[in-house]
């Protein structure tokens, strides 16, 4: 309908204003509205002026129109020529009454369709509905994806590319892990991925100063160690070191008036030489205290070694051995005196006998023909040794004896000379001072070890070897090695240790094979003035453990493998250590601190006597244990 109207209008315009000249009224009849007429007529006059000479009057007159006038006039009413719309953004241009209308393509706006709509910034369709990147384009937009993603068929959503499936060898020997938009080459903990070699490399954490004292790096990890022998233990952060603290304080008060007989593991505590008038006879008086059952109290000899007298303890009773040119005798008698009480002992050479008294009561009288020691040059020269004898004497004894004696003497009077001179020597030497109060047991001060040689192989048993251990302990610190079996290659195939528990004021007992804990008894209150009892039995097939609370046969997946390691070591030679470890690497065991406290050990039915040890640190007390420190009102 519109085009028909346009054609009619065009025909009227041709007839009225080109073939003939028209005035404004006649033009009004063609356009039938004022805006178009007002727009057309001034431009029509310009066309006429261009193609006709002289002034044009509005009076109607006939004329021959030039073809150029026709084209000039025909062009006047078309508002869409020349095109006013933005070519990129318009869909169509509509000629209006002295105006135009540009119809815009989708994505464009404005009177002339000159403004691109940024669909990515549409508040009613945020980001153009794209899941990742919205790219605006002239008149449109499209969605795109970040690296590592692909566009889905809906052209809006992105899907992660699984690089691990696409390229299985992308990480080499490491594990490929797909992550949104990317992938990661993962290594086990303690390893770092090397891009060049496409492999996992061990991180040397020790080079990064992770540990306070000692660090051992191993593939995939590291372990920190603290010097237990210097009294340190690993803190809970497993990196720093802290002092092994006392959990049960002991009364370590000593008195110089009390002479400690076990100052040396091997050797004499005190050596005295007397030069007295020849009429002198041997005499010794002293108070004596011990829990030890065997050992040398005193040994006296002549200057030429030809005569000697031994005062010792055997089976808890006084024993006297003597030898001179006339006789050779051994006598044991009296009551058992290794009761931890002070006993007054006197040994006196009489004219025809040697009298031994305990608490002033005669317990032995030994006949002797002639003097014990022969005077020479009008003098009686005598050498006196406390708690031991010269090494060469050992072979001359009538009955061998273990000379080591853990005991104390006080109020001594030798050769009726009193204690003059001796006290002064002792006063300056702390090691020679005896504890004021002691109890039965063995004391490990946390500074050394004792070594035993024990044969664990039982030929009659099908197991081949077995270790049955009973421990009675009263620890003073919560961390330390109580018992360890050490191989010749400096490994520790079995150890029983104490560690402070994570729960406050309690301890754990660890059983370990080499540096692996095979069992942990948790949270025992061992730091008390009561002794704790622990037993375990181990052979190549089983590990059984009993505490006062429970008896347990331990079994877990890894145990048989660990017992196989122990079995291999037991078939070779192992040394038994009490109270700590010898010089083995820090990484050999989970714990390397010395044990501090009282402990009695029974292995395979035999109560271990520290006096029988192959070696023992001097500070370990074989048969005496300090009492628990009692808080007094003044302290």
């Amino acid at each position: 309908a519109n085009s028909l109207l346009e054609e009619t209008k065009q025909g009227n315009l041709e007839r009225e204003c080109i073939e003939e000249l028209c005035n404004k009224e006649e033009a009004r009849e063609v356009f039938e509205n004022d805006p178009e007429t007002d727009y057309f007529y001034p431009k029509y006059l310009v066309c006429l002026r261009s193609f006709q000479t002289g002034l044009f009057t509005a009076a109607r007159q006939s004329t021959n129109a030039y073809p150029d006038l026709r084209s000039c006039v025909n062009a006047i009413p078309d508002q869409c020529s020349p095109l006013p719309c933005n070519e990129d953004g318009y869909m169509s241009c509509k000629d209006g009454k002295a105006s135009f209308t540009c119809t815009c393509k989708p994505g464009w706006q404005g009177e002339k369709c000159e403004f691109d709509i940024n669909e990515c910034k549409d508040p009613s369709n945020i980001n153009g509905g794209c899941s990742q990147i919205c790219d605006n384009t002239p008149g449109s937009y499209h969605c795109s994806c970040k690296n590592g993603f692909v566009m889905l068929s809906n052209k809006k959503d992105c899907k992660d590319v699984d690089e691990c499936s696409l390229k299985p060898s992308i990480c080499g020997t490491a594990v490929c892990k797909n992550i949104p938009g990317d992938f990661e080459c993962e290594c086990p903990e303690g390893y770092r991925y090397n891009l060049k070699s496409k492999s996992c490399e061990d991180i040397d954490e020790c080079s990064e100063n992770m540990c306070a004292q000692l660090c051992v790096n191993y593939p995939g990890g590291y372990t920190c160690y603290c010097d237990g022998k210097k009294g340190f233990k690993l803190a809970q952060d497993q990196k720093s070191c802290e002092v092994v603290s006392v959990c049960l304080p002991l009364n370590l008060d000593t008195k110089y008036e009390l002479l400690y007989l076990a100052e040396q593991f091997a050797g004499v505590v005190l050596y005295l030489k007397f030069r007295l008038p020849e009429i002198s006879r041997f005499s010794a008086e002293f108070d004596f205290r011990t829990y030890d059952s065997e050992g040398v109290i005193l040994y006296a000899e002549s200057i030429d070694h030809s005569a000697w007298l031994l005062i010792a303890l055997r089976g808890g009773k006084i024993e006297v051995q003597l030898k001179n040119e006339h006789t050779s005798k051994i006598t044991t008698g009296g009551d058992v005196i290794n009761n931890g009480l002070w006993n007054m002992v006197s040994v006196e050479e009489l004219e025809h006998s040697i009298s031994i008294k305990i608490a002033k009561e005669a317990v032995m009288d030994i006949n002797k023909p002639g003097p014990l020691f022969k005077p020479e040059n009008g003098l009686l020269e005598t050498k006196v040794y406390f708690a031991g004898f010269p090494r060469k004497v050992e072979s001359e004894l009538i009955k061998p004896i273990n000379p080591r004696l853990d005991g104390c003497i006080r109020s001594w009077n030798l050769m009726k000379q009193g204690a003059s001179g001796i006290k002064e020597i002792i006063q300056e030497k702390q090691n020679k001072h005896c504890l004021v109060t002691v109890e039965k047991g063995s004391y490990y001060p946390g500074s050394g070890i004792a070594q035993f040689h024990i044969d664990y192989n039982n030929v009659s048993s099908a197991e081949g070897w077995h270790v049955n251990v009973t421990l009675n302990i009263r620890p003073s610190t919560g961390t330390g090695v109580m018992l360890a079996l050490v191989s010749g290659n400096n490994t520790v195939p079995f150890a029983v240790s104490l560690v402070d528990s994570t729960s406050e004021k309690s301890q754990d007992i660890l059983l370990s094979v080499e540096n692996t804990v095979i069992y942990r008894i948790q949270a025992l209150s061992l730091c008390s003035d009561q002794q704790s009892h622990l037993e375990f039995r181990v052979n190549r097939n089983n590990l059984e453990l009993s505490t006062p609370l429970k008896i347990e046969t331990i079994s877990h997946e890894d145990l048989q493998r660990q017992l196989a390691v122990l079995d291999k070591a037991m078939k070779a030679k192992v040394a038994t250590y009490l109270g700590g470890l010898p010089d083995v690497p820090f990484s050999a065991t989970p714990v390397n601190a010395f044990y501090n406290g009282c402990m009695e050990v029974n292995i395979n039915g035999v109560q271990l006597d520290l006096d029988e040890a192959i070696s023992k640190h001097n500070d370990i007390r074989a048969h005496s244990c300090p009492s628990v420190w009692k808080k007094t009102k003044n302290s």
Partner: antibody, heavy 112, light 107 residues
């Protein structure tokens, strides 16, 4: 028809955390962008942030250290958490799908 | 952040009047400017997006114009239901921001 409903405490003490829930019906929060906008007592509107259909978030930098927008697709709900609030956070809080569908708003007063 | 300033803050008109509300941006925002109406106790409603693009369901008496930094919302022959707050909002750059609003009230 998409409908959004804000819910949560109307009174929050200073220094505490403001927590609001937007429950959506008529549409799934796994499509589109889901926004939080607030209007202060003086009629000022502030755009707070969005959580998208994929779970990615955008926060207005002025709130970044305090704001968290999360969602639970199984409940078709999304959430606003604003930490360490002060009296300045007193406003009407709106949730909206794009900016075309809005909840009716909930007034939250921060006061001791 | 882009600041949008609306003027006047309040406009008092009689129903039947035609009005123009202004929104000025602190920097050019191209045509990423949208208008919202908020009546008392209601939530905002999108009226016009991208300066002049009409939203379905919105009466044709609402129209928009402008570009760059200066924009206008025109209401041809105001009706009683048109009274309330009008906000402009830009989506040119994050964070999206709103103008302070113009209150259209009955004279």
């Amino acid at each position: 028809e998409v409908q959004l409903q804000e819910s949560g405490p109307s009174l929050v003490k200073p220094s505490q955390t403001l927590s609001l829930t937007c429950s959506v019906t008529g549409d799934s929060i796994t499509s589109g962008y889901w926004n939080w906008i607030r209007k202060f007592p003086g009629n000022k509107l502030e755009y707070m942030g969005y959580i998208s259909f994929s779970g990615s978030t955008y926060y207005n930098p002025s709130l970044k250290s305090r704001i968290s927008i999360t969602r639970d697709t199984s409940k078709n709900q999304y959430y606003l958490q604003l930490n360490s609030v002060t009296t300045e956070d007193t406003a009407t809080y709106y949730c909206a799908r794009e900016f075309a569908y809005w909840g009716q708003g909930t007034l939250v007063t921060v006061s001791a | 952040d882009i600041v949008l300033t609306q003027s006047p803050a309040t406009l008092s008109v009689t129903p039947g009047d035609s009005v123009s509300l202004s929104c000025r941006a602190s920097q050019s925002i191209s045509n990423n400017l949208h208008w919202y109406q908020q009546k008392s106790h209601e939530s905002p409603r999108l009226l016009i997006k991208f300066v002049s693009q009409s939203i379905s369901g919105i009466p044709s008496r609402f129209s928009g114009s402008g570009s760059g930094t200066d924009f206008t919302l025109s209401i041809n022959s105001v009706e009683t239901e048109d009274f309330g707050m009008y906000f402009c909002q830009q989506s040119n750059s994050w964070p999206w921001t709103f103008g302070g609003g113009t209150k259209l009230e009955i004279k």
